[in-house]
């Protein structure tokens, strides 16, 4: 929802968290602001305090319940409001009717581990965190490998067009240090976006056997 120079963007992690960012040019200084969530079909409502992340933007996480509890479904709409204190009252600064399963951003994959490493190959696995059972297998992944002397931005993206929580990296250089990251995205949702990248996993390929051509 955009009001003039105000932008209010939220994502649902598919379980029990809605993360929001509100930005406004020339925003009010030293004012307490919060996001209020009011679902149209459920009994709970929730509030979080907006905290500054830059000169003109604030963020907060609406914690709806235990991390793995399913608090919303595809039938739900949540009214999200940015409220800022003006003296003794609260003023509505932004509002949106939020469809959680149209605005998904999952948690970054976790538990990355090297399953098997060789001189030229490395098999890596991971797990998804706090992802709804509603997706079944309707997820995709992107992965990237950081090679020596390169940046993450230069790393080519490997796309896994299915729910595959492992990858076999090939054509690696022996006895070389690498880092690996992965992210996940549901296929569902008009405004759904990629999760953050996972924490990087560092690994080293095995050295080539002595006296052998590599």
């Amino acid at each position: 929802a955009v009001n003039g120079t105000s932008q209010f963007t939220c994502f649902y992690n598919s379980r029990a968290n809605i993360s929001c960012v509100w930005s406004q040019d020339g925003a009010l200084q030293d004012t307490s602001c919060q996001v209020h969530a009011w679902p149209d079909r459920r009994r709970w409502n929730q509030t979080c305090e907006l905290l500054p992340v830059s000169q003109a933007s604030w963020a907060c996480n609406l914690i709806l319940g235990a991390p793995d509890s399913q608090k919303l479904t595809t039938v739900d709409i949540v009214t999200l409001r940015v409220l800022c204190r003006e003296g003794v009252r609260w003023r509505v600064m932004a509002i949106q009717d939020f469809k959680p399963f149209e605005n998904l951003r999952l948690m970054a994959p976790i538990s990355l581990q090297v399953v098997h490493v060789e001189t030229h190959r490395c098999n890596i696995s991971w797990e998804i965190s706090q992802a709804s059972h509603y997706f079944e297998r309707h997820l995709e992944f992107e992965a990237r490998t950081l090679s020596p002397g390169h940046t993450w931005e230069e790393a080519p993206l490997l796309t896994l067009k299915q729910k595959q929580e492992w990858i076999c990296l090939e054509t690696l250089t022996p006895d070389t240090q690498y880092e690996f990251q992965v992210r996940v995205k549901p296929l569902q949702g008009e405004f759904t976006t990629w999760s953050p990248w996972s924490q990087p996993l560092a690994f080293r390929t095995k050295p080539a056997a002595l006296g052998k051509d590599t």
Epitope: D40, R41, R42, R43, Q70, T73, T74, V75
Partner: antibody
Framework: QVQLVQSGAEVKKPGASVKVSCKAS????????ISWVRQAPGQGLEWMGD????????NYNEKLQGRVTMTVDTSTSTAYMELRSLRSDDTAVYYC?????????WGQGTLVTVSS | DIQMTQSPSSLSASVGDRVTITCRAS??????LNWYQQKPEGTLKLLIY???GLHSGVPSRFSGSGSGTDFTLTISSLQPEDVATYYC?????????FGQGTKLEIK
């Protein structure tokens, strides 16, 4: 206190239409979905659809094959359910219910009898 | 559509008994399961919402449990006024669906 009061019993001929009303009081009418549920004699409960009075948005059970229309009049806090092309198997008690994490308040029911 | 299957379809118990009614969903509905009581005259009341939430005004002898596909309504000590038909209902997805009902009688 929250109350949902429905219109009285109706007797209709096959092929006709019926419109049942549900007047809400004791809460903000525009803030909660209203569902319609029916129960044929000696049978279980069947969800027909729902309407959000704040926007007029509706969801219908496809089994009713486009024969149902739900509307609201926010000025009188009243919800309406119209069922067209009535058949004998539409004979049932029709209930309205407020939705808030389950149907937390129900109307008293309206008996609609379809008979030639 | 999600099918809801209740068991038993009817049961008879004595005052003071512990009574359990089960409900099974044809697919995972997380905790989006509600229980209703319908008295013989037709009046419907919400007892339990979101699997285990006790609706206001409902006696504490009623409780709910479960997750995913299997759910239970328990009456810890049956009272004469509990004679009714009990229904489970999923509000996980449209169309909402109900179990076929469990008719509870006093011995």
């Amino acid at each position: 206190q929250v109350q949902l009061v429905q219109s009285g019993a109706e007797v209709k001929k096959p092929g006709a239409s019926v419109k049942v009303s549900c007047k809400a009081s004791g809460y903000t009418f525009t803030s909660h979905w209203i569902s319609w549920v029916r129960q044929a004699p000696g049978q279980g409960l069947e969800w027909m659809g729902d309407i959000y009075p704040g926007s007029g948005n509706t969801n219908y059970n496809e089994k009713l094959q486009g024969r149902v229309t739900m509307t609201v009049d926010t000025s009188t806090s009243t919800a309406y359910m119209e069922l067209r092309s009535l058949r004998s198997d539409d004979t049932a008690v029709y209930y309205c219910a407020r939705e808030r994490g389950g149907f937390d308040y129900w109307g008293q029911g309206t008996l609609v009898t379809v008979s030639s | 559509d999600i099918q809801m299957t209740q068991s038993p379809s009817s049961l008879s118990a004595s005052v003071g008994d512990r009574v359990t009614i089960t409900c099974r969903a044809s697919q995972d509905i997380s905790n989006f399961l509600n229980w209703y009581q319908q008295k013989p005259e037709g009046t419907l009341k919400l007892l339990i919402y979101y699997t285990s939430g006790l609706h206001s005004g409902v006696p504490s002898r009623f409780s709910g449990s479960g997750s995913g596909t299997d759910f239970t309504l328990t009456i810890s000590s049956l009272q004469p006024e509990d004679v009714a038909t009990y229904y489970c209902q999923q509000d996980n997805n449209h169309p909402y669906t109900f179990g076929q009902g469990t008719k509870l009688e006093i011995k």
